[in-house]
């Protein structure tokens, strides 16, 4: 039976130009995490194996960055970042957990006005 | 003035589906995010899913994901939503709503689409 | 998913009266960078519902000094300093700062 939970950094608003921390944490379970995915939409970001350790996609290697933890920096945001973000975690035994950020990225303009904005 | 517009009321019978539509003028359509929302028995509010007219992204509540479907035309700054394989439990009140930008609320509303499924 | 639990679910007031709203989540609706995304929405019969309150505290744009909001964390309350006609409807609170978001289960705002 799957009894873990996953916590995350929680929805996101961020200006364009600046950087952001996805994380999530498996909880409630002592199941053994083999993999994390981070995918957006049906794009995968990167992996972090248990025994290989990170991988980036090529396409996204300038502006992600591993850590810290199984988390992934996003760097350098874009208007075209805005959307839903998942981490993907492969377990054993449970079998997969997945967690949801979505991320909104604003022009600074709307900065001004808006949220406390979220720039590490 | 935000103004969004929605399709007419829906009688739909029960296994088909249907499509519902929603026009915003007033604000620069591709900039802020759009919501779905139903409402149900007079009452309670769901909250169904959202889309990026930007980059036509989509995020749905797990409940929904399969049922509704998404979409947006930006040349007619238009959001729509399609509902497949309607029973009497999708009967309800369903609503647009404009995300305000930076805070994860909803700040301008459609008038809200009463759909009825029934034999 | 965050479950959103307001109180009362019926709220019977006179014209004048000061009233309180609680909405209380399952988990806490501050995100790892400071930002709480709660709001408050007043649904009245046969319109839309209109947003009041957005991020805890800010009043949206034309709606009256009346209407304020606090809290943090998984508690958050709503007030009217003095309730008039146009108030009475069914009042939400929104969480979106988990996926999914989520709605409170109302709470109606009727005369006595």
């Known amino acids: 039976m799957m009894t873990g939970t996953i916590e995350t950094t929680g929805n996101i608003s961020a200006e364009k130009g600046g950087s952001i921390i996805l994380q999530c944490h498996l909880s409630s379970t002592t199941a053994q995490v083999t993999q994390v995915n981070w995918e957006q939409q049906d794009q995968l970001l990167a992996i972090c194996n248990a025994d290989l350790g990170w991988h980036i996609s090529p396409s996204f290697k300038d502006r992600v960055a591993p850590g810290p933890g199984l988390g992934l920096t996003l760097q350098s945001l874009t208007v075209n970042d805005t959307g839903e973000y998942f981490c993907i975690y492969h377990t054993y035994p449970d079998g997969t957990y997945t967690g949801r950020i979505f991320l909104e990225v604003l022009e600074s303009s709307v900065a001004e006005h808006g949220a406390r904005f979220q720039i590490p | 003035e935000v103004q969004l517009q929605q399709s007419g009321p829906e009688l739909v019978k029960p296994g088909a589906s249907m499509k519902i539509s929603c026009k915003a003028s007033?604000?620069?359509?591709?900039?802020?995010?759009m919501n779905w929302v139903k409402q149900s028995h007079g009452k309670n509010l769901e909250w169904i899913g959202l889309?990026?007219?930007?980059?036509?992204?989509?995020s749905y509540n797990q409940k929904f994901k399969g049922k509704a479907t998404l979409t947006v035309d930006k040349s007619s700054s238009t959001a729509s939503m399609e509902f497949l394989s309607l029973t009497s439990e999708d009967s309800a009140v369903y609503y647009c709503a404009r995300g305000l930008r930076g805070y994860y609320a909803m700040d301008y509303w459609g008038q809200g689409t009463s759909v009825t499924v029934s034999s | 998913d965050v479950v959103l639990t307001q109180t009362p679910l019926s709220l019977p007031v006179s014209l004048g009266d000061q009233v309180s709203i609680s909405c209380r989540s399952s988990q806490s609706l501050t995100n790892s960078y400071g930002s709480t995304f709660l709001s408050w929405y007043l649904h009245k019969p046969g319109q839309s519902p209109q947003l009041l309150i957005y991020?805890?505290?800010n009043r949206f744009s034309g709606v009256p000094d009346r209407f304020s909001g606090s809290g943090s964390g998984t508690d958050f309350t709503l007030k009217i300093s003095t309730v008039k006609p146009e108030d009475l409807g069914m009042y939400y609170c929104?969480?979106?700062?988990?996926?999914?978001?989520?709605f409170g289960g109302g709470t109606k705002l009727e005369i006595k």
């Open positions: 991020g805890i505290s």
């Open positions: 889309i990026i007219p930007y980059n036509g992204g989509t």
């Open positions: 929104l969480q979106g700062t988990h996926q999914p978001w989520t």
């Open positions: 007033g604000y620069s359509f591709i900039d802020y995010i």
